[in-house]
């Protein structure tokens, strides 16, 4: 069964800046990755970025830079300033759509300590 992992890290240089990394563990070709915050995309979450392997990347504030790290993992940097900036207990979710298997999603938030955390 495919799985999704989510890692949330606060940047040491900018304490209100976050990096979210997500990956897909499974076969099948990834068709779309959706990153949201405040919960899963279908349950009240707000979309931060949508990454398509062929048609490019769309992102919305406070997302600053979304990119593919590998064919099955992505990263997203969030701008730290402004009213829409995330706080330490914000939940971030990643949904990977793989054809023809379907979609898998997982959520994560900043770990209690300042160490990078892994949530699957």
């Amino acid at each position: 069964t495919p799985e999704v992992w989510v890692q949330v890290r606060m940047e040491a240089t900018e304490l209100s800046s976050f990096t979210i990394r997500c990956g897909f563990l499974g076969s099948g070709s990834i068709s779309l990755v959706t990153v949201s915050w405040g919960g899963p995309n279908g349950a009240g979450g707000t979309t931060l970025a949508v990454l398509h392997p062929e048609r490019g990347i769309r992102q919305w504030a406070p997302a600053r830079q979304a990119r593919w790290e590998t064919q099955s993992s992505i990263s997203l940097i969030l701008e730290g300033s402004g009213a829409s900036s995330p706080c330490a207990n914000t939940t971030f979710c990643c949904k990977f759509a793989s054809f023809p298997e379907g979609s898998w999603e997982a959520c994560g938030s900043l770990p209690p300590s300042s160490d990078p955390g892994l949530s699957a």
Epitope: S29, G102, S103
Partner: antibody, heavy 120, light 107 residues
């Protein structure tokens, strides 16, 4: 304008074979996942086969596994369904459809359908 | 496989009526739900994707809502051309499965 045009349906005896074709135009065929969906007379819709845009991943339900084969020819902008060992319960209108990644794999374009009748 | 149970299976209504069709998934399907309209002898047409997004050219009287396992298609004011069969579909997990359909007839 996106167009999908099926052909190859007809009357065939139980145990016989048919090859359905779907000619695509008006879009970059190689960028889309494709499926065959059938509808028995007076019944609902059933996915019978799907193929990823790169052609590497396919799906078949148990009802047709081992008897049907989906394939695509991106140079010809065509989708195919080879149907062997046909049974009376395969009688249906067969539709070719296109999946849109950005719509959660919803099928945003359909052909007009081609009728397959399996009868002795 | 995820089962999509649609209700009612048939419905009689009049032009101008507000109509609601429901679809219940056997497990959570996130927001990967679409609705299709099919008229006799024709192919299905996409109406709604991602639960609530209207496809290009679909009139605003059609709306979708729901989350998790329970979804609804609403037609706010029926028009003569809306009498057709409607199907829900989940595209969350393979195989994509459809509801059994709701036939909307003129009262």
């Amino acid at each position: 304008e996106v167009q999908l045009v099926e052909s190859g349906g007809g009357l065939v005896k139980p145990g016989g074979s048919l090859r359905l074709s779907c000619a695509a135009s008006g879009f970059t065929f190689s960028s889309y996942h494709m499926s065959w969906v059938r509808q028995a007379p007076g019944k609902g819709l059933e996915l019978v086969s799907a193929i990823s845009r790169d052609g590497d991943s396919t799906y078949y339900p148990d009802t047709v596994k081992g008897r049907f084969t989906i394939s695509r020819d991106d140079a010809e902008n065509s989708l195919y369904l080879q149907m062997n060992s046909l049974r009376a319960e395969d009688t249906a209108v067969y539709y070719c459809s296109r999946h849109e990644d950005y719509f959660g794999f919803a099928m945003d374009s359909w052909g007009q359908g081609t009728l397959v009748t399996v009868s002795s | 496989d995820i089962q999509m149970t649609q209700s009612p299976s048939s419905l009689s209504a009049s032009v101008g009526d507000r109509v609601t069709i429901t679809c219940k998934a056997s497990q959570s399907v996130s927001n990967d739900v679409a609705w299709y309209q099919q008229k006799p002898g024709k192919a299905p047409k996409l109406l709604i994707y991602y639960v609530s997004n209207r496809f290009t050219g679909v009139p605003s009287r059609f709306s979708g809502s729901g989350s998790g396992t329970d979804f609804t298609l609403t037609i706010s004011s029926l028009q003569p051309e809306d009498f057709a069969t409607y199907f829900c579909q989940q595209a969350y997990r393979s195989p994509w499965t459809f509801g059994q359909g709701t036939k909307l007839e003129i009262k």
